[in-house]
Structures are given as structure tokens and as C-alpha cells.
């Protein structure tokens, strides 16, 4: 069998979520010493990069102006070092948001309830869609999917204190394109009275890996980035739909 | 800076015969999928061809199988589109690209075009 390099990395640079008009940024972190990458858009070469100088950086950005729906889609990236390819990176899914119209989110039986209460969301769009997604920030990556005419539900069965948050919805007009965001519903669940003031509270940083960190190479810095970047592609997973 | 350039049409009595050709620089050509797309006045673009990068696989519009033939020269980073028995409907500019689903001359890298007029 030919002889390939490891896989890139692919990631969405802040998020894989992207306004409609608003540029997407996808990294490709691959090897220091490649001399060309490569950005798939649904298995056709849509962008070329050379870096320069190639043995001192380890990736590349891919910026993705004006997004819209049909450049919205499963994405991967591919280097080249010498006459080397890598294998194709995992595909990455980057949605295209404000699309047509917002929904309406809301929660039965109220935004503050307490441990142990079954909590359901109710997404409604008067518009024409048959999927709906609801999302927790700080989390975007669990995206769970539920179904309607108009509206759909969400039961979240009894919950916990780490159901606490902020939660919003869309509604999606196929896998790729969503509309507006709606409004955020923030969930407070209160627990046992004695544990209440010390259940920390949801963290709504954007997910550690929706950051590029393509860095340049300094003296010890090869080797602990090939480490890496092994480990990293033996733990990384991107599929999200 | 990635280039596609085409080259190779013309008028052409129908009945008649082109070669198209398109030069590639800038990326690894060889494995890379390549299309023909063309669009008529008027008219949406239509991918009328497809080859892998290896040339192991390639497609054709049903208006134009029997007719027209795919090939690549990935040494010379040269893709090319023989088209035989030209129709008046075949009347088109062609362009070469990167796009194998998107037909869209904004998506991708996609050449100038090169024009094809089959008239008597």
C-alpha cells in the first residue's frame, strides 16, 4: 500500500455555526514542513494553500467568504509534505445560520425548576421546516434534533443542576442551513438546599477545540507538536451530525 | 496562485470536431478531480464531463456520451475534453474546473472559459 502521512486536523474557527454573509474560517492543522494543503468541500478541491516558509508553521486558514447554503456542507483537508500525501482529514460540517426565520423557544413547566423535575423545550417555527435543534451554550457540538410541522418538543426527562444553562434553538431546513437563532431560554435548576450555593454553573466558553492553534516552530517545538498531533488524531473525532 | 487556462475552441460545422485543452498550476493536479462544465447563453452551467485523479473513473452528460472523451496528462498538469460529432446544441462556453457538485463559478477554481460555436 502507498505510503501516507498522518491526517490533518480539521476545525472551525470559533464556531461551525456561521451567519449567512459572514466569513467562515476553517484551519487545517497538519505538519511543519508541508508544502501545500488542501480545503474538500463535498469531495471537490475548493482552496489551495502554500505556506511560507512551509517548515515553520504547522497549518493553514481557509477563509470562506460571504458564506451561504451551498457552500455549507461537509469539509476536509488534505498536505502534502514532498512528494507525500497525508490521508483526508475527518469531515467537518459547517452550517450556515440566519436563514429565513427565527423560531420560538420556550420550557415547560418554567425556566426555574428543581432537581429531579421532568423539563420539556417546545421549539416552534410558523415556517416551513420539518427539523428542529436545540442547543445548549458552551456546547454546540450536542446539537439534539427533534421533529414537526410547526413545532416540536425536547423532553429532557428529570433533571439535574447540569442541565443548568442557556439554551437555544433553530429551526433547519436541511442538515446544513439554519434559520435565526432564537431568543435564549436560560434553565435554572436549583438542587438539595444544602448543595445549592456550591453546583457550579454550566461554563459557556465557546468548546476548547473550535479554536485554531496553528503555531509556528520554535527550537524543542517539532518534536512535542508531532506528539501532538498523533495524539490529538488519535482522540479527535468530528462528525457532528 | 492557482491558475486554470482553456484553450482550443471555435467555430465548428456541425458534424465537426474539437480538442479543448486547460494548463493547471498552482496545486498537486494529480490528485485532484477535474470537470468540463459549460453554459450556454441564457442557460445554467452543465457539468458535461468528470475525471478522478488518477483517470481510473470518469462521467459524461447524457447528451454528450458517444461524443465527447475525458483525459488527463497529470505529468504535464494538462486536462483535456476531445469532442466529436459536434450539434449546434453543443454551442457553449467550456470551462475547466475543480467543482465536481457545485456548479457555481464562484465555488472553487475555475478557468476563463474557452467558446465553442458549432454553426453551418
Known amino acids: 500500500p502507498k505510503q501516507t502521512l498522518p491526517k490533518p486536523i480539521i476545525r472551525a474557527e470559533s464556531t461551525y455555526m456561521v451567519p449567512k454573509e459572514k466569513q467562515a474560517t476553517l484551519c487545517c492543522q497538519g505538519s511543519y514542513g508541508a508544502v501545500e494543503y488542501q480545503l474538500h468541500f463535498e469531495g471537490s478541491l475548493f482552496a489551495v494553500e502554500r505556506p511560507k516558509p512551509p517548515e515553520r508553521i504547522n497549518g493553514v486558514k481557509f477563509h470562506i467568504p460571504d458564506m451561504n447554503s451551498r457552500k455549507a456542507g461537509r469539509y476536509s483537508c488534505i498536505y502534502r509534505v514532498g512528494e507525500l500525501w497525508s490521508e483526508r482529514s475527518d469531515l467537518l460540517d459547517l452550517v450556515v445560520t440566519e436563514m429565513y426565520d427565527t423560531p420560538t423557544l420556550s420550557v415547560h413547566p418554567g425556566p426555574e425548576v428543581t432537581s429531579g423535575e421532568k423539563v420539556t423545550f417546545y421549539c416552534r417555527l410558523d415556517t416551513a421546516t420539518s427539523m428542529f435543534l436545540l442547543l445548549k451554550e458552551g456546547r454546540s457540538r450536542d446539537v439534539q434534533r427533534s421533529y414537526g410541522k410547526v413545532q416540536a418538543e425536547f423532553p429532557m426527562g428529570p433533571v439535574t443542576t447540569a442541565h443548568r444553562g442557556s439554551y437555544r434553538c433553530f429551526g433547519s431546513y436541511n442538515n446544513y442551513a439554519w434559520s435565526f437563532p432564537s431568543e435564549p431560554v436560560k434553565l435554572l435548576v436549583t438542587g438539595d438546599i444544602e448543595n445549592t450555593s456550591l453546583a457550579p454553573t454550566d461554563p459557556t466558553f465557546p468548546d476548547s477545540w473550535d479554536t485554531c492553534l496553528l503555531t509556528r516552530e520554535t527550537g524543542l517545538q517539532k518534536d512535542l507538536a508531532l506528539w501532538d498531533h498523533t495524539a490529538q488524531n488519535h482522540h479527535h473525532h468530528h462528525h457532528h451530525h | 496562485d492557482v491558475q486554470l487556462v482553456e484553450s482550443g475552441g471555435g467555430l465548428v460545422q456541425p458534424g465537426g470536431s474539437l480538442r479543448l485543452s486547460c494548463a493547471i498550476s498552482g496545486f498537486t493536479f494529480s490528485i485532484v478531480s477535474m470537470s468540463w462544465v459549460r453554459q450556454a447563453p441564457g442557460k445554467g452551467p452543465e457539468r458535461v464531463s468528470w475525471i478522478n485523479g488518477d483517470s481510473s473513473n470518469t462521467s459524461y452528460a447524457d447528451s454528450v456520451k458517444g461524443r465527447f472523451t475525458i483525459s488527463r496528462d497529470n505529468a504535464r498538469n494538462m486536462l483535456y475534453l476531445q469532442m466529436n460529432s459536434l450539434k449546434s446544441e453543443d454551442t457553449a462556453r467550456y470551462y475547466c474546473?475543480?467543482?465536481?457538485?457545485?456548479?457555481?463559478?464562484?465555488?472553487?477554481?475555475w478557468g476563463q472559459g474557452t467558446q465553442v460555436t458549432v454553426s453551418s
Open positions: 474546473t475543480t467543482q465536481n457538485s457545485h456548479y457555481d463559478i464562484r465555488f472553487g477554481y
